[in-house]
């Protein structure tokens, strides 16, 4: 079972992931982003359910498409290049979800815009942070 220190580490990692996702959302929602309309045409797969750390498998599988869409944005909207930003997120996601490779993601029937996709995973992080005991 997780110890208080491992739970604290998990919360810190979730907070880091949350900040990264919020930074991306803020960057693409920036009124100066001329590519937003184009970015909104890309469709992302949403997890059928996302309430536990193992469901981060669904986020991991969508990180490559996310990087591709972020490459459309002006780099000045982000502190890091999309490749580095996504790499950082990937490291956190892998640590959080653990090494269980048999867990397969299931997706919702409806696809989402990049804004909806990011908001979903932001909600996920906020929910886990607030209810993890």
């Amino acid at each position: 079972a997780p110890t208080s220190s491992s739970t604290k580490k998990t919360q810190l990692q979730l907070e880091h992931l949350l900040l990264d996702l919020q930074m991306i959302l803020n960057g693409i929602n920036n009124y100066k982003n001329p590519k937003l309309t184009r970015m909104l045409t890309f469709k992302f797969y949403m997890p059928k359910k996302a309430t536990e750390l193992k469901h981060l498998q669904c986020l991991e599988e969508e990180l490559k498409p996310l990087e591709e869409v972020l490459n459309l944005a002006q780099s000045k909207n982000f502190h890091l290049r999309p490749r580095d930003l996504i790499s950082n997120i990937n490291v956190i996601v892998l640590e959080l979800k653990g090494s269980e490779t048999t867990f397969m993601c299931e997706y919702a029937d409806e696809t989402a815009t990049i804004v909806e996709f990011l908001n979903r995973w932001i909600t996920f992080c906020q929910s886990i942070i607030s209810t993890l005991t």
Epitope: P2, K49, T51, E110, R120, S130
Partner: antibody, heavy 117, light 107 residues
Framework: EVQLVESGGGLVQPGGSLRLSCAAS????????LAWVRQAPGKGLEWVAA???????YSPDTVRGRFTISRDNAKNSLYLQMNSLRAEDTAVYYC???????????WGQGTTVTVSS | DIQMTQSPSSLSASVGDRVTITCKVT??????VAWYQQKPGKAPISLIY???LRKSGVPSRFSGSGSGTDFTLTISSLQPEDFATYYC?????????FGGGTKVEIK
């Protein structure tokens, strides 16, 4: 056949403690998230706590710090340790299995907790 | 927390009637809605999830629909054993929340 059987309910005084148990069978216990849901007399359903397959635990503000959910995979058992009980904790407590990608798919028959002086 | 507003809170109907129960959610939950049936003194049983898939063994007269923030449980032809209380629930995010319930009574 999936079965969940709760036990441990009873009458307890305000401020007292109680430990509920849920014995599970018919599925690979260690692979699933388990939850406790309660129902006050004449009221609706309220989610109380959950514990995932990695033993991370989740609970709402109403019980956090007072109730602790735990599991013993070797015994196929789920527990709810309830401390500092209040009159408003009086309810039927149900153990439920949370499916990996959907809702609470199987429920126990419930055990009654009464907090009264 | 996500709120679930279920309506009506109670209804009277006859055997053979078509019954519709609705659940309005305060934010989009991407179909992560389930419906449960509960009879007096018994545990809830899972009927519908996701939000239109019937659990194995549930009669075809029960159906679920909806998207976004509005969801519906329909009983196409009410049977004597269907008189019970029905609850919706969101499992999109913790804390899981339930609707207040709809009691279906005999007219």
């Amino acid at each position: 056949e999936v079965q969940l059987v709760e036990s441990g309910g009873g009458l307890v005084q305000p401020g007292g403690s109680l430990r509920l148990s849920c014995a599970a069978s018919g599925f690979t216990f260690s692979s699933y998230t388990l939850a406790w849901v309660r129902q006050a007399p004449g009221k609706g359903l309220e989610w109380v706590a959950a514990i995932d397959s990695s033993s991370y635990t989740y609970s709402p503000d109403t019980v956090r710090g007072r109730f602790t959910i735990s599991r013993d995979n070797a015994k196929n058992s789920l527990y709810l340790q309830m401390n500092s009980l209040r009159a408003e904790d009086t309810a039927v407590y149900y153990c439920a299995r949370d499916s990996n990608w959907d809702a609470l798919d199987y429920w126990g028959q419930g055990t009654t907790v009464t907090v009264s002086s | 927390d996500i709120q679930m507003t279920q309506s009506p809170s109670s209804l009277s109907a006859s055997v053979g009637d078509r019954v519709t129960i609705t659940c309005k959610v305060t934010e989009k939950v991407w179909g992560n809605v389930a419906w449960y049936q509960q009879k007096p003194g018994k545990a809830p049983i899972s009927l519908i999830y996701s939000p239109s898939l019937r659990k194995s063994g549930v009669p075809s007269r029960f159906s679920g629909s909806g998207s976004g923030t509005d969801f519906t449980l329909t009983i196409s032809s009410l049977q004597p054993e269907d008189f019970a209380t029905y609850y919706c629930q969101q499992y999109y995010t913790y804390p899981y929340t339930f609707g207040g319930g709809t009691k279906v009574e005999i007219k």
